[in-house]
């Protein structure tokens, strides 16, 4: 278990022309509110896919009215950090959304009005109880200047919170086998109650007995790197388990590399293999630069030659974002015909056809069973040249591919608008309300009104639902 | 090919009622958004109408304006109509059928129309 | 809601450089969801700018989209005789219900 921070340093017009009017007039004063939304992983998830890993909602910042004539300036930002606990394992990489909000507070008809004003993502490695890292995004014309880190909440320590300390029982050292508990050195490791040998950087339990492998690592005792096929370099007793030699101690144990960077062994000591925005010899120094590479997908990175001057990512075809990275949605505009599936592979747009149609961009119908079946259980019924589907329930469309209609349950609240989509259906959330299905209100003083958290978690550990 | 072709308009008189019917071919209302009308007065501006979800929900929106004499309504996976009744002469347009997708994050993107259907509204 | 276009009709010569802008008298959705159409006579309108300033499929590069909230602008650059045709601006909005409205257009005239 655990807290990942995020700290707001500045949120305002970026570099270069085409500087941003003001969100607030003095017709229209407004103030700003964030949320955030993490995942597991370094996944490309959708704006709209739930925060697996917690999401939470800042307080509202100050009251801000622009200065008739004035450009935009950095806007006042809300008090204190955004906290989102984490209950299980910190899982070291992840992605992230930070979302910017403006609360309207002319005299609008029933209260106050909300309007995004900028999303910016990213994916991230960070290990837990490291330093606060610095980052720089930009949406369009906006930059938000952050940083973050993940802290474990005792008595869980170590990089993934996974290991547990206890107070010692001794005042002088730690029970046979039992390491002292870094920072915490009064403390120390408790007993292991996972499956003998598990590992304790790269495994964890919740039961005891048992040997659950972080991401990137497997094995019974989450030893064996994910990536490696064969076995690790031998430097130890052989495993009869795995056939496979288990390392001994080394120069990476405890993996000296800060801010997710991760460490391989030289002849004569270590070498951090660091995380965009991290370098240095364990990778402690942050300030995200072009020399860090912080552009995803092929972007060029231009500018940014201090980590106190921004970058900007000109992105390849097929990628936006501050940092490219995010997907262009160019499906959206349904260039498959005929109810074909449209998949961007990024250099070119493929359609898959439903049975009966063929091309490109499936404009050419067959027309006929032979040789064809509908899809999901669907039987298929010849009749003059052309051929129909009788479809399993739960299913529709010339051969059954369609499932059925998702917004038929009109799963979009508080009067948000759905839409089918490729990747299912997506809700369009009328303003004052937010999240997947528009189910939940933002209220004026900043809190979510979320459900109650079920067993195991704190009453005050909501958002993780958002 | 994706296409919208609206039928049903004519010459209708003053306090009369209309029917007018938007055919797709090429993909069905239910694998899109949604499906409106937008009319346009001869030699004037865009005028957004209404609109109905394209799934089996039969969600709508309407313009003020229009609420209370003209209905939106699905008939088939490829048929939409729009109803209008106390017709006057101001109701005289080109009447387009059009499809609203979602579009990052964006919405009312009319991405397709049909040709239109001339309503002509006189004694 | 009521959103402006000014200025019409606008007119300037081939290769040239044409600016229209729209004025929303309130923010539109999301302080983005605005559209630019394209019709010329006889014809329906035609999808070239979204979110403001997201280009529509196949529409040239020589169409930009800009602004938020209230203000939009429109520029066509490198004017062709093709371009010559009414533009109109389109904003989203919610009030107890989703609605949309048009601009009045604004007719570009190519010398």
């Known amino acids: 278990a655990g807290v990942f921070e995020l700290q707001i340093h500045s949120f305002g017009p970026g570099p270069g022309p085409g500087a941003p009017r003001s969100p607030c007039s003095a017709r229209l004063p407004c103030r700003l509110f964030f949320r955030v939304c993490l995942k597991p992983g370094l996944s490309e998830e959708a704006a709209e896919s739930p925060c697996a890993l917690g999401a939470a909602l800042s307080a509202r910042g100050p009251v801000y009215t622009e200065q008739p004539g004035a450009p935009a300036p950095d806007l006042p930002l809300p008090d204190g950090l955004l906290q989102v606990p984490f209950r299980d394992a910190w899982p070291g990489t992840f992605s992230f959304i930070i979302e910017t909000w403006r609360e309207e507070l002319g005299d609008q008809i029933g209260g106050p009005a909300w309007s995004l004003l900028a999303r910016v993502a990213g994916r991230r490695r960070l290990a837990a109880g490291g330093p606060w890292a610095r980052d720089i995004q930009r949406a369009g014309a906006w930059e938000l200047r952050f940083s973050y880190r993940a802290r474990c909440e005792p008595p869980a320590v170590g990089t993934a919170c996974t290991r547990l300390c206890r107070p010692r029982s001794a005042p002088s050292r730690c029970g046979p086998g039992l390491r002292p508990c870094a920072p915490l050195e009064d403390e120390c490791e408790a007993p292991l109650v996972c499956r003998a040998g598990c590992s304790p950087e790269h495994g964890f339990c919740e039961q005891p007995g048992e040997c659950r492998c972080l991401e990137g690592w497997t094995g019974p005792l989450c030893t064996v790197p994910v990536s490696t096929s064969s076995c690790l370099s031998p430097r130890g007793p052989s495993s009869a388990t795995t056939g496979c030699l288990v390392p001994g101690p080394g120069p990476c144990d405890g993996n000296p590399c800060a801010n997710g960077g991760s460490c391989s062994e030289t002849p004569r000591s270590f070498e951090c293999t660091c995380p965009r925005g991290f370098y240095g010899l364990r990778c402690e120094v942050s300030g995200v630069t072009c020399a860090d590479g912080p552009c995803f997908n092929g972007g060029l990175c231009v500018g940014g030659a201090d980590p106190d001057s921004a970058y900007i990512c000109h992105c390849p075809p097929g990628f936006q974002g501050s940092n490219c990275e995010k997907r262009v949605d160019r499906c959206s505009l349904q260039p498959c015909r005929n109810g074909g599936l449209c998949l961007d592979l990024g250099h070119a747009l493929r359609c898959r056809c439903r049975a009966g149609f063929a091309g490109p961009r499936c404009e050419h119908d067959l027309d006929d069973c032979a040789g064809r079946a509908c899809a999901n259980g669907g039987t298929c019924v010849e009749g003059g040249g052309a051929h129909r589907c009788s479809c399993a329930l739960g299913f529709g469309g010339r051969d059954c591919r369609e499932r059925a209609d998702p917004c038929a349950a009109r799963p979009c609240a508080h009067g948000g608008r759905c839409y089918a989509h490729f990747s299912g259906l997506v809700c369009a959330c009328a303003p004052g309300y937010m999240g997947a299905r528009c189910e939940f209100p933002v209220h004026p003083d900043g809190a979510s009104a979320l459900p109650a958290a079920p067993p195991g978690l704190r009453p005050g550990d909501p958002q993780r639902y958002l | 090919q994706e296409q919208l072709v609206e039928s049903g308009g004519g010459l209708v008189q003053p306090e009369g009622s209309l029917t007018l019917t938007c055919t797709a071919s090429?993909?069905?209302?239910?694998?899109?958004?949604?499906m409106c009308w937008v009319r346009q007065a001869p030699g004037k501006g865009l005028e957004w109408i209404a609109c109905?979800?394209?799934?089996?929900?039969?969600?709508t929106d309407y313009a003020n304006w229009a609420k209370g004499r003209f209905s939106i309504s699905k008939t088939s996976s490829t048929t939409v109509t729009l109803q209008m009744t106390s017709l006057t002469v101001a109701d005289t347009a080109t009447y387009f059928c059009?499809?609203?997708?979602?579009?990052?994050?964006?919405?009312?993107?009319?991405?397709?129309w049909g040709p239109g259907t001339l309503v002509t509204v006189s004694s | 809601q009521v959103l402006t276009q000014t200025p019409s009709p606008v007119s300037a010569a081939v290769g040239g450089t044409v600016t229209i802008s729209c004025q929303a008298s309130?923010?539109?959705?999301?302080?983005?969801?605005l559209a630019w159409y394209q019709q010329k006579p006889g014809q329906p309108p035609k999808l070239l700018i979204y979110?403001?300033?997201s280009l529509a499929s196949g529409v040239p590069s020589r169409f930009k989209g800009s602004g938020a909230g209230t203000q939009f602008t429109l520029t066509i650059s490198d004017l062709e005789c093709d371009d010559a045709a009414t533009y109109y601006c389109?904003?989203?909005?919610?009030?107890?219900?989703?609605?949309?409205?048009f601009g009045g257009g604004t007719e570009v005239v190519v010398k």
């Open positions: 109905i979800s394209g799934g089996s929900s039969g969600d």
């Open positions: 389109q904003g989203t909005y919610y009030s107890s219900g989703w609605y949309s409205t």
């Open positions: 059009a499809r609203d997708v979602y579009i990052d994050s964006t919405i009312f993107n009319f991405n397709l």
């Open positions: 090429g993909f069905s209302f239910s694998s899109s958004g949604y």
């Open positions: 979110a403001a300033s």
């Open positions: 309130q923010s539109v959705y999301n302080n983005n969801n």
